[in-house]
């Protein structure tokens, strides 16, 4: 996409990691069939993808979760793709919502988010969910990535 | 994205095809509003997209299916994006799962998968589903593609 | 992706806008964290993205909606990504369908569409849904965009 030293390809694809933390921010790892093109994009603290160069990026996330209507809150399961730019508040870029299933013990559903956004140097993107304990971490079910246009 | 003879654009978008085969691998065709940029990506045996050049690719698939909880197995409908690299076993890149609907005769649902992956020359990607007979083949419902970064 | 004056980056990401119109075509706005790379892609009449240059584009849309099986028609909620090329009829590029939820008052669900398509100069893409009144317009829930390869 970007050729030569001036324009190296910048892309990442990271894999979900189960976490004992109670935070709503999903955890990721460079494991399995992951992608990390170079040090112009990095996975920081296992939770956010941080870019060194300004530009337009296609950013995506996929979250598979298993929930049950009776065992969950009334509110739907929501996955949010969020941005933290240097010196700025965090903001939501994309969200998706799925009502809980009536299947027992739980019903699996998958959410896909993706869009083109301008990122500043040092900007980080991360994924937030309403209930991380419901997220499926089996091979390929939950992942997160970006590519620089 | 890639300009000049050295760096031609490489992209494909193929359309689902109903199949009498009992295989779980979905069938595709170059029909309708399809894309096949050049011979650096090919649709082989109507089932896999094969690339000639090594590099990073954004690969995606969309599957719409119609199923009913009572008529289906307990297991959810799962769509898998799989990779076959030369000399290596097939492996799962991405998966999405949706529990069957209680709607009658069946309830439609759509799954979208997408991610950035490194492919070797001669690598093939294909889409596997738990029950191909449930897949919807109406215009635009089920498709598969890639683009080289 | 495309560097220099000859090959400027072309990308857009627009945000859903509630509309009093009864049309099934969704309305969009350049608001919030939107992207409009330059005048080689424009949002026309708040409803379609129009490109000036021929080429391959990755086009995507995400639609979140809230519906209830009893209050809705029997037919599922369908989102369609459509193309209008100069001098040609409109055509469907991609569709996704989700059966209505049994949750009350309504159950939220998200749809994601995306694919690589050849666009002619002056071609426009837009998003159609079966019931625009069910679409969710909260931050990040419903968006539409493209990028030129």
């Amino acid at each position: 996409m970007q050729k030569g030293d001036q324009n190296p390809q910048i892309a990442a694809h990271v894999i979900s990691e189960a976490s004992s933390k109670t935070t709503s921010v999903l955890q990721w790892a460079e494991k399995g069939y992951y992608t990390m093109s170079n040090n112009l994009v990095t996975l920081e603290n296992g939770k956010q993808l941080t870019v060194k160069r300004q530009g337009l990026y296609y950013i995506y996330a996929q979250v598979t979760f298993c929930s049950n209507r009776e065992a969950s809150s009334q509110a739907p399961f929501i996955a949010s793709l969020c941005l933290k730019s240097p010196g700025r508040f965090e903001r939501i870029l994309l969200r998706a919502a799925n009502t809980h299933s009536s299947a027992k013990p739980c019903g699996q559903q998958s959410i896909h988010l993706g869009g083109v956004f301008e990122l500043q140097p040092g900007a980080s993107v991360f994924v937030n969910v309403t209930d991380p304990s419901q997220v499926s971490h089996g091979t390929g079910f939950t992942s997160f990535g970006l590519l620089k246009l | 994205m890639q300009k000049g003879d050295q760096n031609p654009q490489i992209a494909a978008h193929v359309i689902s095809e109903a199949s009498s085969k009992t295989t779980s691998v979905l069938q595709w065709a170059e029909k309708g509003y399809y894309t096949m940029s050049n011979n650096l990506v090919t649709l082989e045996n109507g089932k896999q997209l094969t690339v000639k050049r090594q590099g990073l690719y954004y690969i995606y698939a969309q599957v719409t299916f119609c199923s009913n909880r009572e008529a289906s197995s307990q297991a959810p409908f799962i769509a898998s994006l799989c990779l076959k690299s030369p000399g290596r076993f097939e492996r799962i890149l991405l998966r999405a799962a949706n529990t069957h609907s209680s709607a009658k005769p069946c309830g439609q649902q759509s799954i979208h998968l997408g991610g950035v992956f490194e492919l070797q020359p001669g690598a093939s990607v294909f889409v596997n589903v738990t029950d191909p007979s449930q897949v919807s083949h109406g215009t635009g419902f089920t498709s598969f593609g890639l683009l080289k970064l | 992706m495309q560097k220099g004056d000859q090959n400027p980056q072309i990308a857009a990401h627009v945000i859903s806008e509630a509309s009093s119109k009864t049309t099934s075509v969704l309305q969009w706005a350049e608001k919030g964290y939107y992207t409009m790379s330059n005048n080689l892609v424009t949002l026309e009449n708040g409803k379609q993205l129009t490109v000036k240059r021929q080429g391959l584009y990755y086009i995507y849309a995400q639609v979140t909606f809230c519906s209830n099986r009893e209050a809705s028609s029997q037919a599922p909620f369908i989102a369609s990504l459509c193309l209008k090329s100069p001098g040609r009829f409109e055509r469907i590029l991609l569709r996704a369908a989700n059966t209505h939820s049994s949750a009350k008052p309504c159950g939220q669900q998200s749809i994601h569409l995306g694919g690589v398509f050849e666009l002619q100069p002056g071609a426009s893409v837009f998003v159609n849904v079966t019931d625009p009144s069910q679409v969710s317009h909260g931050t990040g829930f419903t968006s539409f965009g493209l990028l030129k390869l």
């Epitope: - | 799989c82 000399g87 076993f89 097939e90 799962i92 596997n128 | -």
Partner: antibody
């Protein structure tokens, strides 16, 4: 130690089907693929197809595509090959072979002789 | 399909001889090539995988080389138990294909 034990010799009539089994021991079944190779008397080796039990994906040689079905039962660590519409030319020794990811066929079964005769 | 051509189809050699068998693929297969030994009325046995890696338990007199389209199996010093038929096989892509075999006989 690794062993692939195949079912016994079969005599079948033309037009019928045969199902040969291959029970694996001495390794995690799902970590491998299981291939079927046949050898007509006095001739070379011919690959028929294989199954990857972990993903339940079977692949076949075009020549056998319409007649062969390869399956695996993870609970018993057994791979199966069923060949239908048998003809006299299918008289051969049928071998199963375990495949390592990236490493070819490391172990072979003892073979099952299938004779097709009216 | 990828065709595998083995040569020679047969050869006669004496104990202690250095024996070389070649295998050519009709298109590039990187290093995804295996060699097997088969004795009469027996199942094949794996010797070499990934063109040059020796299968566990196989004597070091056997070696493999090559990549792309041209491959070689070498037996540095032929032993009495090495008289057999040898097959190359590509597992680069489906359908996996074997060479026609090389029969090594006692001179």
């Amino acid at each position: 130690q690794v062993q692939l034990v195949q079912s016994g010799a079969e005599v079948q009539k033309p037009g019928s089907s045969v199902k040969v089994s291959c029970k694996a021991s001495g390794g995690t079944f799902s970590n491998f693929a299981f291939n079927w190779v046949r050898q007509v008397p006095g001739q070379g080796l011919e690959w028929m197809g294989r199954i990857l039990p972990s993903l339940d994906i079977a692949s076949y040689a075009q020549k056998f595509q319409d007649r062969v079905t390869i399956t695996a039962d993870k609970s018993t660590s057994t791979a199966y090959m069923e060949l239908s519409s048998l003809r006299s030319e299918d008289t051969a020794m049928y071998y199963c072979a375990r495949e390592v990811d990236g490493g070819g066929f490391d172990y072979w079964g003892q073979g099952t002789l299938v004779t097709v005769s009216s | 399909d990828i065709q595998m051509t083995q040569s020679p189809s047969s050869l006669s050699a004496s104990v202690g001889d250095r024996v070389t068998i070649t295998c050519r693929a009709s298109q590039g297969i990187s290093s995804w090539l295996a060699w097997y030994q088969q004795k009469p009325e027996k199942a094949p046995k794996s010797l070499i995988y990934a063109a040059s890696s020796l299968q566990s338990g196989v004597p070091s007199r056997f070696s493999g080389s090559g990549s792309g389209t041209d491959f070689t199996l070498t037996i540095s010093s032929l032993q009495p138990e090495d008289f057999a038929t040898y097959y190359c096989q590509q597992y680069n892509s489906y359908p996996f294909t074997f060479g026609g075999g090389t029969k090594v006989e006692i001179k």
